[in-house]
Interface confidence: low
């Protein structure tokens, strides 16, 4: 699990931000049916209740809000739009709400919202605008701090043409929008590839979850400019190797803790590097618990104990006896 | 390319009501705001109300409530406004704008909308 | 509701001038939702300037923009003709949003 922040500590300290006007401002405290509001907690919680729209009555006080395990569908533009605004809105948790589409400016009017988890829905349509703004042509800040999207692949039937990797990623960059943020999961999301570039513009990440994903190489992924990076979980991957850039990206961040256990590390020839920096680094925790699985000969070996002698690749064979 | 286009200008008599639209183009109609602006000639812009068409969420300035009545299409990608009880005050050039808190970045061409008998 | 003062009402400017329009507010606005429109006789308003100072697409570098609180500017480094145009500014801060009552920028 992450070391998200708990809810009641956030602040609202985020500038007023200007949203839609309701006709009567709610009673501050009224509670919307089918919810349970404490305002001691600042907290709402409207759980289980197959709700399909998020309520339009929420109190002014809440800074907590709950809204697990309904039945969304869709998070249109300012679905979260009131005048006055939600303005002490820090913590919006929509995980297993069966929300397939987040559209352009979904969050917009949350001045404070600094977490916001949406784990646990099959987005089939997530806008690229919709951490940015309800603009076309303009983006500012997302006051989001902890972004957590953890198992948000829809099923095949359901997917988009277009990749999920791109989508998730045009979303996570549009208008630089969060820039701000220090956590971001995304585990769980069957990701073959992390898009180029994305994490160029998550610049203040602390915190970045991509565990549990079927990722087969970091080759193009920059964490260069990832300066503040404390922790990267790539545990449950498909990754073979890391690879000299990778390995020299890693080791130059002064704060990093990588996890990198239950790949299908081959150990042949080109695992010399790595091996050569396990032993020497302090960056990977857990590094001796990672293992070969290929090829065969080398399955449940330690990395940390093999050495060059160890690492061989096989002769290339002439074609006539080349097998698949 | 994005564009609202808006409907013909209107003649109307004192007391009468009027039903205007914008129909957008080139963006995903429910992905943002409409807005509806007034323009008195020779005068200063007055913002009248905004919908969320994704969710038909409709916000009104009080000065305009009971009398405007916003409403959209999503099937026709069009948004109306209505205004009832008609005086000459409210002969004007109305706009529809598309955008959100960080400004109206496309506007239609605006209707003209004449209050006369 | 916050009321947004505009001043000068009129202004003539000679070609290569320095411009400066005014915009204050009758209480604080966050420089975020603070914009400026450039509009010309018989056009729809055009989005100049958002969040206080960044330029809408299209707009010419010579334009910029400033403040914060209640005081807020727009500069034309170099007026030039096709500047000669009415400029409103408007605050999404609070409802009922606002604009000022315009400001018109005439070549002299």
């Known amino acids: 699990s992450s070391p998200t922040s708990s809810a009641s500590s956030f602040s609202s300290s985020a500038p007023f931000l200007a949203s839609a006007a309701s006709a009567q401002p709610p009673l501050p405290d009224q509670c919307p049916a089918l919810c349970e509001c404490s305002e001691a907690a600042r907290t709402v919680k409207c759980v289980n209740r197959n709700l399909t729209e998020v309520p339009t009555d929420l109190p002014l006080y809440v800074r907590n809000l709950f809204l697990t395990g309904n039945q969304l569908a869709v998070l249109p533009a300012g679905a979260f739009a009131r005048r006055p605004p939600l303005a002490e809105l820090a913590a919006l948790n929509l995980s297993g709400s069966r929300l397939d589409e987040v559209r352009a400016g979904a969050f917009e009017h949350l001045p404070s919202l600094r977490q916001l988890d949406l784990s646990h829905n099959p987005l089939a349509y997530l806008s690229p605008f919709a951490f940015s703004g309800s603009n076309a042509s303009i983006s500012a800040p997302s006051p989001l701090v902890e972004l957590i999207l953890n198992h948000i692949v829809p099923p095949d039937d359901k997917r988009q043409n277009r990749s999920f990797e791109g989508m998730v990623a045009a979303a996570l960059v549009a208008g630089r929008a969060l820039q701000g943020l220090h956590l971001l999961e995304l585990a769980s999301n069957h990701f073959l590839y992390l898009p180029r570039d994305v994490l160029a513009q998550l610049p203040s990440l602390r915190y970045l979850d991509l565990s549990n994903n079927s990722l087969v190489s970091l080759t193009y992924v920059s964490f260069r400019n990832l300066t503040h990076l404390e922790s990267l979980h790539l545990e449950d991957n498909a990754l073979k190797v890391l690879h000299n850039g990778t390995l020299a990206e890693l080791q130059g961040l002064p704060h990093v803790r990588v996890f990198l256990d239950n790949n299908p590390w081959v150990c042949d020839c080109h695992m010399a590097d790595m091996v050569t920096w396990l032993k020497q680094t302090e960056v990977v925790q857990g590094k001796d618990r990672l293992t070969c699985a290929f090829p065969e000969k080398m399955r449940n070996r330690v990395l940390l104990e093999l050495n060059s002698a160890d690492l061989d690749c096989d002769p290339i064979l002439p074609p006539s006896l080349q097998t698949s | 390319q994005v564009q609202l286009q808006q409907s013909r200008p209107e003649l109307v008599k004192p007391g009468a009501s009027v039903k205007m639209s914008c129909k957008a183009s080139g963006y995903t109609f429910t992905d943002y705001v409409i807005s509806w602006v007034k323009q008195r000639t020779g005068q200063g812009l007055e913002w009248i109300g905004e919908i969320y068409p994704g969710s038909n969420s409709i916000y009104y300035n009080e000065k305009f409530k009971g009398r405007a009545t916003l409403t959209a299409d999503k099937s026709s990608s069009t948004a109306y406004m209505q205004l009832s009880s008609l005086t000459s005050e409210d002969s004007a050039v109305y706009f529809c704008?598309?955008?959100?808190?960080?400004?109206?970045?496309?506007w239609g061409q605006g209707t003209t909308l004449t209050v006369s008998s | 509701q916050i009321v947004l003062t505009q001043s000068p009402a009129i202004m003539s400017a000679s070609l290569g001038e320095r411009v400066t329009l005014t915009c204050t507010a009758s209480?604080?606005?966050?420089?975020?939702?603070l914009h400026w429109y450039q509009q010309k006789p018989g056009s729809s308003p055009k989005l100049w300037i958002y969040s206080t100072s960044n330029l809408a697409s299209g707009v010419p570098a010579r334009f910029s923009g400033s403040g914060s609180g209640t005081s807020y500017s727009l500069t034309i480094s170099s007026m030039e003709a096709e500047d000669a145009a009415t400029y409103y500014c408007h605050q999404y801060h609070r409802s009922p949003l606002t604009f000022g009552a315009g400001t018109k920028l005439e070549l002299k």
């Open positions: 704008a598309m955008g959100g808190n960080y400004g109206f970045d496309y």
């Open positions: 209480s604080s606005v966050n420089s975020n939702y």
